[in-house]
Interface confidence: low
Amino acid sequence: VTGSRVYPANEVTLLDSRSVQGELGWIASPLEGGWEEVSIMDEKNTPIRTYQVCNVMEPSQNNWLRTDWITREGAQRVYIEIKFTLRDCNSLPGVMGTCKETFNLYYYESDNDKERFIRENQFVKIDTIAADESFTQVDIGDRIMKLNTEIRDVGPLSKKGFYLAFQDVGACIALVSVRVFYKKCPLTVRNLAQFPDTITGADTSSLVEVRGSCVNNSEEKDVPKMYCGADGEWLVPIGNCLCNAGHEERSGECQACKIGYYKALSTDATCAKCPPHSYSVWEGATSCTCDRGFFRADNDAASMPCTRPPSAPLNLISNVNETSVNLEWSSPQNTGGRQDISYNVVCKKCGAGDPSKCRPCGSGVHYTPQQNGLKTTKVSITDLLAHTNYTFEIWAVNGVSKYNPNPDQSVSVTVTTNQAAPSSIALVQAKEVTRYSVALAWLEPDRPNGVILEYEVKYYEKDQNERSYRIVRTAARNTDIKGLNPLTSYVFHVRARTAAGYGDFSEPLEVTTNTVPSRIIGDGANST
């Protein structure tokens, strides 16, 4: 049974004679008259087992002492620390030539842990040990023991274990303690990587490369490596680990972010408090959940506050000009905490009798600068129908509006367009052509914008180039133009009139009268 003694963390003790309780029982040769096991008191009055020999009067001493088998435990190099006292030969009368002040240290590697005899020729000499301090008779009287400490190392070792031996050649020695140990680089954590206990290399200059493993809840950034030096010190840390998302470094560990905190990426250094309007109720959160009614857009970073759709635009003003409307408004009171606000225009055409019966305006209406994604707070809407009720909604939108489309985000106004002149006539056709007449027909304008009172036909000879033209008016959508010259090209234009005035003339229709009495019937815009 061994008692525990405290040694440096980088030393692993294989044998410590001072920790053994009871007899050491090492093997001595010769069995009698050489090394002898003696119990003495140490500086704390604790009994310790020592081996002593003091055959200084007799010549040719060869006294051997061998330890029990010492396991190697994977060490390739071991260290032997010997604490001993040695008597000064000059203080002993009449021992000149026989008294020595050194002893020899040997080792022998073996896989056999039960060798009973000392075979001197098997042992390999490690060194001759001399004392730095020797004591005299006076010192003994004053109970001053001059303790020497010598350390030697041996390696590389390869067998399961080994024996140590001490050879006395005629000195007066007390082996107070023998400790055998090897050196390791102790388990350590550097840069969030754990490096295991590592036994040092076989020789005193070797470095052992060790790959570290990332601590719990961390991941490799660069492969973590260190070198274990021969003295049991870690050298040259390379690479590192990073705490996973949801974890941060605390006291060399990766601990989960506390509730109310988060860490989105392993490359972030520490957990951050949840941004405004968000929370986390799990430890180890990698993102925070938005409060009810708040949202994150797809491209919002986890560090951004959660935001809301904006409130409705304010102060919507309309200005009707015949079949055009100009709308202006003010920014919403609450932008929802975002900068990416824009506006969409919704146009609804509503029945005069029942304003609740509305339907979309369709593609014929035009918006300047645009209908959706407006960055300005005004829009011009044209090509509306006259005498019609319209409802215009202005929607304020931002990057999170799609998550919660809410009527509170829009403001609306209802207007009635004024009387306006009709639009131009799209299609005029020559239905019959004779020597002296042309029968014309046309379609109603796309947008009459009211009741059409009459149509006006303007015509002239093509080579007169509108210098001399004639007008014919009719309430119908067709008319016969008579009194024309034969074999002559004429140009015809038609326009409609309402109470609001004339519309634009149609595109020119060119027709050539005939030379023969018979009639020619045509549909084209340029009948000949």
Epitope: N244, A245, G246, A256, I259, A264, L265, V281, W282, E283, G284, T286, S287, T289
Partner: antibody
Framework: QVQLQQSGPGLVKPSQTLSLTCAIS??????????WNWIRQSPSRGLEWLGR?????????DYAVSVKSRITINPDTSKNQFSLQLNSVTPEDTAVYYC??????????WGQGTLVTVSS | QSVLTQPPSVSAAPGQKVTISCSGS????????VSWYQQLPGTAPKLLIY???KRPSGIPDRFSGSKSGTSATLGITGLQTGDEADYYC???????????FGGGTKLTVL
């Protein structure tokens, strides 16, 4: 509407492995706002949380200390399901096993439950 | 032995009010949200209350939750025979790094 459908044997022999699967519809096992849990219930133990799997840019697992050495919970993204494996079972593991979705520390959707009896 | 402590049973007449307590510690109820579950015989538990006092859609406002310090309470007013069930509280335990439940309370409507 989220639904969880459990499947797996109701009888397991002692020392063998208990295996159950939970198929998800109406949500994704890879959702980054939910965790997918296994919970069991027995007269002696009451409701006992066993563990969960969840995805937050990578997969994570958390397990109860009482079963940590024996439990594995795996997601299967291709089938949108997750599974429970409990090794070296004993009669003490006899219970009704539930899968459940955890959204912010409350279990808002549960599977129908599977009674697993450990007996030879 | 459950981490959270609930009374084994409570009872009241139809139309009456009943409360069920759930006691824990600072590592669970004290620093985390509490949820409550109703388990009708032969069925899976059903979420009644989350985040201490919020009701999922479809849960009538007869059910309410509250939390104070390291204890939480479930309240049920206007008791109905259909409310006869087992009720469980649950929360996260920061020390155990696990979800923990109470032992359950059997509600009897007299």
């Amino acid at each position: 509407q989220v639904q969880l459908q459990q499947s797996g044997p109701g009888l397991v022999k002692p020392s063998q492995t208990l295996s159950l699967t939970c198929a998800i519809s109406g949500d994704s096992v890879s959702s980054n706002s939910a965790a997918w849990n296994w919970i069991r219930q027995s007269p002696s133990r009451g409701l006992e949380w066993l563990g969960r799997t969840y995805y937050r840019s990578k997969w994570y697992n958390d397990y109860a200390v009482s079963v940590k050495s024996r439990i594995t919970i795996n997601p299967d993204t291709s089938k949108n399901q997750f599974s429970l494996q409990l090794n070296s079972v004993t009669p003490e593991d006899t219970a009704v096993y539930y899968c459940a979705r955890d959204s912010l520390r409350s279990f808002d959707y549960w599977g129908q439950g599977t009674l697993v009896t450990v007996s030879s | 032995q459950s981490v959270l402590t609930q009374p084994p049973s409570v009872s009241a007449a139809p139309g009456q009010k009943v409360t069920i307590s759930c006691s824990g510690s600072s590592s669970n109820i004290g620093n985390n949200y509490v949820s409550w579950y109703q388990q009708l015989p032969g069925t899976a538990p059903k979420l009644l209350i989350y985040d201490n006092n919020k009701r999922p859609s479809g849960i009538p406002d007869r059910f309410s939750g509250s939390k104070s310090g390291t204890s939480a309470t479930l309240g049920i007013t206007g008791l109905q025979t259909g409310d006869e069930a087992d009720y469980y509280c649950g929360t996260w335990d920061s020390s155990l790094s696990a979800v923990v439940f109470g032992g359950g309370t059997k509600l009897t409507v007299l």
